[in-house]
Every structure is written in C-alpha cells, then in structure tokens.
Amino acid sequence: VPRWRQQWSGPGTTKRFPETVLARCVKYTEIHPEMRHVDCQSVWDAFKGAFISKHPCNITEEDYQPLMKLGTQTVPCNKILLWSRIKDLAHQFTQVQRDMFTLEDTLLGYLADDLTWCGEFNTSKINYQSCPDWRKDCSNNPVSVFWKTVSRRFAEAACDVVHVMLNGSRSKIFDKNSTFGSVEVHNLQPEKVQTLEAWVIHGGREDSRDLCQDPTIKELESIISKRNIQFSCKNIYRPDKFLQCVKNPEDSSCTSEI
C-alpha cells in the first residue's frame, strides 16, 4: 500500500537534483581556482542536511548555516550587481563584464539557480512530486528560505556603489515584495554602501519615456534615502545595444545614450 504523501501546490524537486547540485559544484570549483579547496561531497551533504527529514514548511536560516560556511567566497564588495525580474540580462551582463557578480555567479547561487527542492518530515526521501508554493502553502519552505538567506548575505557584503538591474516592462518596476525589495534593499549596510544605482531596462523599441520617474522608482528612492544611502537611476533604452557596448566600448555608436 503506497504511503500517504503531502500534496503541495508547487512543482516537485527538480529531477536528478542531487546529481545536478554535485555536478554544478564540481564544474564551478574547476572553473574558479579560488574555490578549488571546496569538497563538493561535503557541500552536497550540507545542502541535503538543510532540508532532508524536515517539514518543508518549517525550514529556518539556521538550517542552511553549515552550507553557508562551506560555500564561503569573498566577493569584491564594490562589484555587486543585484537584479529584480530581469535575471537573464543581468547574467548576460556579468558574463561580459567579468569583474562584476550577481548572486548566481557565486558558488551558492550557481548551485541552486532555477532548481526546486524539498523533503518530507521524518523520512530521508526527496519529494519529487510536489513542494510548497510560497503563496499557496508556506513561505518558510526550503527554496524560499535558501534564497532569502543567500540574498541577505550577498546584500550585506556590498560596498561603495551597488548596481541593481530592474525590469522596465513590469507594472511594478520596483516591487517591494520581490527578493530585492523585501530582503536585499533592507540589508545594504549604510556604513559602507554609498550609492544604489538602478538601471531600468526598457522593453519596447520605441520606448523613450524616462522610467526613472516611475512612482515605484520614487518609492525605492525614498526607502534608500531613509537608510542614508544615496540613490541614482539610469534608463537603459536599448538593452541589446547596452550589452554590445559593454563588449565593445570603443565602438563609435557607444558614446550616445543607450
């Protein structure tokens, strides 16, 4: 008789999750010499230990503490790029601008990017059928708590000028409920962060509006200013040209506004 299993509203653990995490760890540590000391089996054990046999609605930041310690990686604090609802362009940018880092350019972010995982209380099984949805089931689920934990720490590490890429095509360009709006903004350290610079990415070819005047951007400016951090904003009217100019800054067409 099959055991009763909790049905959650969200998709289940990504297939071949253990193999994927281990393979990503090995690949990352091979590419990044400063992380060659990392024992990927220990990393997987710590990752697994954070959620296996635990109720998937009762995960805490402390559960991820051993993984956070094993994944310690000093990031140049003045080269941090945050993003909200525009991950692909942010990643394309750091692939070209190699000295800048999104969270997913770190080992911990790279391991978990686009994956889903959860376990079941009191069994060592990984749940491949369903996992808790943040809205419909619970917020303290393994995936949400992981991203909240690493995002908080990533923002805490930032200094000088911090950049954030925002999606100008969304109804809320800045969303207080996004990871950026609810976690990262509030964990920038005013003692060492001088300025948050927002890059608002335009979607439409003929969109010449100044999206830095959008009410949600003004809301972001207000939140940041109250935290004694300066705020600046730039429109990126042509994201394709923007990337091209990052690749080839000497190009004559790159002196004009992008």
């Epitope: 402390e62 310690k69 000093t74 911990l108 690493v150 720490r153 805490e156 590490a157 060492k192």
Partner: nanobody
Framework: QVQLQESGGGLVQPGGSLRLSCAAS????????MGWYRQAPGKQRELVAA???????NYADSVKGRFTISRDNAENTVSLQMNSLKPGDTAVYYC??????????WGQGTQVTVSS
C-alpha cells in the same frame, strides 16, 4: 584594515573562570558569524563556540554547559565566558569572523592555561 584583538587569557586554577573578549575593528561585526576556536600544542584547531549574525549559538560537546558565547554588536565585541575550567581546556584561543560573501578573519590568539 580588519583587526580582531583577543584579550582576557591567562593562568587559572581548575574549576576557575575566565572571560575572553574579542574586539573587532574595520568590519561591521553585526553581519558576521562569530566563533571561538582553540588549538592545544600538537593538536588541530577546533571550534569551541559560535554565534550567528542572528544570534543562534552552538557549542562543542566538551564545553556545553560550561562556556557561553555572546556578542555586543554596538560595541563590536564578542565574548566567551568560561566556567568550571579543566586542564583539558588549556590552549591558545582564537576569535574568528566569518561571512559567506564578505570574508573570513582571525585574531592572533590569547593563551589560556588551566593548572594548579
């Protein structure tokens, strides 16, 4: 320039108490997970006690119930209260600051000797 400066070590009789303190400069202590490690002659460095940035603590089995770690973020210090000391606690004690993305730092160490 990041500095972790330990103080409070010394010679104490078995059953006695000491309070070690670690003063941090050049870092925002509140975002760091802090720990006390010790190294006895000819042995590996081992974790004694740790406190996360959110205040959760954990201890080596050998010191549970005897040692207490605490932090004062306003003063940028972390302390280790050591009671019921035993000869086996004799070691150099090191302060450690660890942040997933902001770096790992060590103090120079302070000697603790438990002997009658």
């Amino acid at each position: 320039q990041v500095q972790l400066q330990e103080s409070g070590g010394g010679l104490v009789q078995p059953g006695g108490s000491l309070r070690l303190s670690c003063a941090a400069s050049g870092i925002i202590l509140r975002i760091y997970d802090m720990g006390w490690y010790r190294q006895a002659p000819g042995k590996q460095r081992e974790l004694v006690a740790a406190i996360t940035s959110r205040g959760s603590t954990n201890y080596a089995d050998s010191v549970k119930g005897r040692f207490t770690i605490s932090r004062d973020n306003a003063e940028n210090t972390v302390s280790l209260q050591m009671n019921s000391l035993k000869p086996g606690d004799t070691a150099v004690y090191y302060c450690n600051a660890d942040h997933t993305f902001a770096g790992v730092y060590w103090g120079q160490g302070t000697q603790v000797t438990v002997s009658s």
